[in-house]
Interface confidence: medium
């Protein structure tokens, strides 16, 4: 009997026509949301007069549904069982999901002043930024809709520079009619033990933002592994969002609408330190921000945001260094709420519940030419806003996932 | 202090090939679009050649006079950018900048095609 | 190709004179992309004015610099000896980018 499922398994995990796991693979029957906490600045004035702490007030959640989209470009690789694809993006907004609408406004660092600043430290360039800054009315922080703030504006500073930039910014911009990849992952036709792991990304098999073995894209994208999961695995994944591989330890036995799955868990030692996890030494890329590389709980990602100083985290910086919080009033980390967690079903390895969390935020530093940034008496990592995204098995297919796969083996 | 410094340059037959090199210091160099611009008594100020970033994919622009003859690269480990060029004439003669142009300029390195 | 036409060629002034030189543009062009420049004999070319009307670090007030569309001009409100040089005006609003042929001040 036992021989027979893993068979069966074995068959159906192939990422090729005709299969469960293909159908599923290629457009996810799950339903997907994103729902988006904004962090509302309340003393703007204070913070750039002052350089008070920043006091934050989470407004949210917004929700999109994500991930609706068919994956495009399949094209299967007979010679080295491969699959490759394109994963399209798309965000539609839930007004009956969400506290407000898209129309909503927010007081938020101003993106384009804070990354100008930081990409271009060049004492002349920053007294040509400083007159565009004041020309264009801009200041440290701006009044942005959600949907100016999440999926793009023309920003006036950026309009006056001397020569033809993009003057769009958004947080996720350009984000609909955009695609992830090309990903190429094994299809497990010749060794299950391999379907769904990335081979190459971008057609590299690696990201060019980190040092060492940091570089490495691991495992697969997460929405499923090779089957029959065991307990004491470390289970590698890959996060374009996040710039890096990362993985999740086993937590607890879950019962999800009836099937017995594994809950992992990011734990707390993949956002530690180099002091605390010499693993982590080639995620430190800077040394002042970092304290030498001491602080914890954030990523500096810039490299991978065309120098932008973009730092990724946990929610209200969840397992984060006292330091990196410290500049910030009005956070409330919590375990239950800011984690990120996968819910797996053991014997095929599909992934039927989720939910990934994590915040974005952007590094602003006192400079003694830009008018608006000179009171500033420290670095600010500020938190813009953060996300969660989650996704879990439907009834009808749960109920199929029952009959057909846990059902059988019980 | 920002600082170009430009060589490579000399004297070269028609038809013939050289590459001209550009090392920056005192700024982010892989920040910038980089330029090539050269300079000569007939022609005076003449934009030759533009690389963006990484970020761009290195995006490439280029004169109408050196299309396909012309090749402008960078290295930003190395703060570096050049130029490669290929089947030389003499109205390619003249003083090569590289500059960000919106920064300083280099003093420039001189080409001369002749024969 | 926005061909750009400066005028005069040259011209002479006396110290504390105001003179002013034009760029004239073949086709209009956004005033945030035209930028001066000044080179004095033997030395490379500095940037002097940027978009339009900015003057870079360490230029002094008296110049200044104004116009839209396909109009350029650049002053200087009292001339001092020190601002004999040939100044071009240059486009960066699409390719191929563009220089004028150069206006050479003269001080007598």
């Known amino acids: 009997g036992d021989m027979l499922i893993q068979k069966t398994i074995k068959k159906e995990v192939v990422l090729e026509e005709g299969t469960i796991a293909f159908k599923n693979w290629v457009k996810t029957g799950t339903e997907i949301y994103r729902q988006f906490w904004i962090f509302d600045v309340q003393n703007p004035q204070e913070v750039m007069m002052n350089s008070s702490n920043i006091q934050v007030k989470q407004r949210g959640p917004y929700t999109y549904r994500v991930r609706f989209l068919a994956k495009e470009n399949i094209t299967q690789d007979p010679k080295d069982n491969t699959v490759s694809f394109l994963q399209p993006n798309g965000a539609i907004f839930e007004p009956s999901l969400s506290v407000g609408t898209e129309a909503d406004n927010f007081t938020v660092l101003n993106l384009a002043v804070a990354a100008a600043s930081h990409i271009y430290p060049n004492p002349f360039v920053q007294v040509v930024l400083n007159s565009l800054i004041n020309k264009s009315k801009s200041s440290m922080f701006q009044v942005r809709t959600l949907r100016e703030l999440l999926w793009g504006y023309t920003d006036p500073f950026l309009s006056l520079v001397p020569y033809p930039v993009s003057t769009r910014v958004g947080m996720f911009y350009p984000y609909n009619n955009t695609a992830d990849g090309v990903y190429k992952v094994f299809n497990g036709k010749d060794s299950i033990s391999k379907v769904a792991i990335i081979d190459t990304y971008k057609g590299k098999r690696n990201l060019s933002y980190w040092e060492s073995y940091c570089d490495m894209i691991n495992g697969t994208d997460a929405a499923s592994f090779p089957p029959f999961v065991e307990k004491s695995q470390v289970l590698q994944f890959f996060s374009s969002d996040i710039c890096r591989s990362i993985y999740a330890v086993f937590e607890s036995d879950v019962n999800l609408k009836g099937i017995p799955v594994y809950r992992f868990v990011l734990p707390s030692k993949a956002f530690a330190s180099p002091v605390q996890n010499p693993d982590n030494h080639c995620f430190c890329t800077e040394k002042i921000i970092s304290k030498n590389c001491t602080s914890y709980g954030v990523l500096d990602i810039s490299k991978c945001k065309e120098g932008k100083p973009v730092y990724i985290s946990l929610p209200h910086f969840l397992y984060a260094s006292p330091d990196v919080s410290e500049t910030i009033d009005g956070l409330n980390p919590n375990e239950e709420e800011h984690r990120t967690y996968l819910d797996i079903e053991p014997i095929t390895g599909f992934t039927l519940q989720f939910a990934k969390r994590l915040q974005v935020n952007l590094l602003v530093k006192p400079s003694n030419k830009i008018q608006v940034l000179k009171r500033l008496k420290r670095n600010y990592i500020v938190p813009i806003l953060w996300l969660n995204e989650t996704g879990t098995i439907g009834d009808e297919k749960a109920k199929m996932f029952r009959s057909q796969v846990t059902g059988k083996i019980n | 202090e920002e600082k170009l410094e430009e060589s490579g340059g000399g004297l070269v037959q028609p038809g013939g090939s050289m590459k001209l090199s550009c090392v920056a210091s005192?700024?982010?160099?892989?920040?910038?679009?980089m330029n090539w611009v050269r300079q000569s008594p007939e022609k005076g100020l003449e934009w030759v050649a533009e690389i963006r970033l990484k970020s761009n994919n290195y995006a490439t622009h280029y004169a109408e006079s050196v299309k396909g003859r012309f090749t402008i690269s960078r290295d930003d480990s190395k703060s570096s950018v050049y130029l490669q060029m290929n089947n030389l004439r003499a109205e390619d003669t003249g003083i090569y900048y590289c500059?960000?142009?919106?920064?300083?300029w280099g003093q420039g390195t001189t080409l001369t095609v002749s024969s | 190709e926005n061909v750009l036409t400066q005028s005069p060629a040259i011209m002479s002034a006396s110290p504390g004179e105001k003179v002013t030189m034009t760029c004239r543009a073949s086709?209009?062009?956004?005033?945030?992309?035209l930028h001066w420049y000044q080179q004095k004999s033997g030395a490379s070319p500095k940037l002097w004015i940027y978009s339009t009307s900015n003057l870079a670090s360490g230029v002094p007030a008296r110049f200044s610099g104004s116009g839209s569309g396909t109009s350029y001009s650049l002053t200087i409100s009292s001339v001092e000896a020190e601002d004999a040089a040939t100044y071009y005006c240059q486009q960066y609003s699409g390719y191929p980018l563009t220089f004028g042929s150069g206006t050479k001040l003269e001080i007598k």
């Open positions: 086709s209009s062009l956004s005033s945030t992309y």
């Open positions: 500059t960000p142009l919106l920064l300083r």
């Open positions: 005192g700024f982010t160099f892989s920040n910038y679009w």
